[in-house]
């Protein structure tokens, strides 16, 4: 069982009651996927200076972030949702050092989905957090057109059809 006895606090003098307070948080839908709204409090809590980031079992830690490498294969959108369900996102690569870390931990030479797709709305390659790709750092081989999603292979980024099935990487 996942449960043992509860922690019961009893007060022997007088009775106590507390009003329950609930906070509601909304979601924001973007490009068929659901991007989560993050409250100010969440943003402040995300990386408190005095808290060391420790990743869960099965996740690898690098530069204060956690990475999960899939073993199965899915389309880009299914991979996107898979990460979202784990309150993470498809991999966003910030620099070549991060790319080197990723490549070191990829044990195969096949394509792997990352959190980058071509949005017809902006007519540009966009990371899943909404930021544009830095063309000074990364070059994407292949067509930049609707229904194009990015996959990495041997430290290079390729444009692939979003419905193709590859492994993927989640990050939080």
């Amino acid at each position: 069982l996942l449960v043992s006895q509860g922690v019961l606090l009893k007060c022997q003098k007088g009775s106590c009651s507390n009003a329950t307070q609930y906070e509601d948080t909304g979601d924001l839908k973007v490009n068929n996927g659901t991007r989560r709204n993050i409250s100010n409090k969440d943003l402040c809590a995300s990386r408190s200076a005095d808290q060391t980031v420790l990743c869960q079992s099965e996740w690898l830690k690098y530069q204060g972030k956690c990475y999960w490498f899939s073993n199965e294969m899915k389309s880009w959108s299914d991979s996107y949702v898979y990460c979202l369900e784990r309150k993470s996102h498809l991999l966003i690569i910030h620099d070549q050092l991060e790319m080197a870390f990723i490549q070191k931990n990829l044990r195969q030479l096949n394509y792997v989905w990352i959190g980058l797709n071509f949005t017809s709305l902006k007519m540009t390659w966009t990371w899943v957090d909404g930021s544009p790709i830095d063309s000074k750092i990364f070059f994407i081989k292949g067509p930049a057109k609707e229904n194009s999603c990015a996959a990495i292979k041997e430290s290079k980024i390729f444009s692939e059809t979003c419905s193709s099935v590859f492994k993927w990487i989640c990050q939080y």
């Epitope: 906070e23 509601d24 993050i38 409250s39």
Partner: antibody
């Protein structure tokens, strides 16, 4: 807010379906979860459904096969329970995991009692 | 499945005192741990999430700490209003997802 309904007295080996109804928000991409509490005992997680397009479900290992969570509308989720035994006697709560980066059940229903 | 274990089984403290509740996960859950307060006849109420972040409206007397497999809830300056049952809940978010609860300590506030 959330409210559970359908709790009842049921015979051993019987089945029962509980409903969780939301008001004040629609299910978009939340986890809607079921938790139970036997009389005088602790909280026990049963399972959750992701109410986004995937509709993925996750269950405690002991609940797989006998318990099924389904999203039946934009404001209702059900818990189907089969082959019930006396050990399933409990108050059943539904809870919503907040739709943000962090894991937390920030809205709970008052619970509904199931007696086997 | 990840198993959460809360300790000790029982503790007694005076009003104004401090209570420390420990929660151990059977494998690393990072900082994905919440603490709840439950009073008889009521549903649980969220106190702390992400191991140390106070939910809105919760007094700062409640403090969460820890990461990985070891977590602690400390309630200082105990008040009568703190009479309740406290639970930790971990979230495991890898190939499978689970939300196990722990249990733990009966605390009597004198």
């Amino acid at each position: 807010s959330l409210e559970e309904s359908g709790g009842d007295l049921v015979q051993p080996e019987g089945s029962l379906t509980l409903t969780c109804t939301a008001s004040g928000f629609f299910f978009s991409s939340y986890y809607m979860c079921w938790v139970r509490q036997a009389p005088g005992k602790g909280l026990e997680w049963i399972g959750c459904i992701y109410t986004g397009s995937s509709g993925s479900t996750y269950y405690a290992s002991w609940a797989k096969g006998r318990f099924t969570i389904t999203k039946t509308s934009s404001t209702t989720v059900t818990l189907q329970m089969t082959s019930l035994t006396a050990a399933d006697t409990a108050t059943y709560f539904c809870a919503r995991d907040a739709g943000t980066t962090y894991w937390r059940y920030n809205i709970w229903g008052p619970g509904t009692l199931v007696t086997v | 499945d990840v198993v959460m274990t809360q300790t000790p089984a029982s503790v007694e403290a005076a009003v104004g005192g401090t209570v420390t509740i420990k929660c151990q996960a059977s494998q690393s859950i990072g900082s994905d741990l919440s603490w709840y307060q439950q009073k008889p006849g009521q549903p649980p109420k969220l106190l702390i999430y992400t191991a140390y972040t106070l939910e809105s409206g919760v007094p700062s007397r409640f403090k969460g700490s820890g990461s990985g497999t070891e977590f602690t809830l400390t309630i200082s300056d105990l008040e009568c209003a703190d009479a309740a049952t406290y639970y930790c809940q971990g979230t495991y978010r890898s190939s499978s997802i689970s939300w196990p609860f722990g249990g733990g300590t009966e605390v009597v506030v004198k």
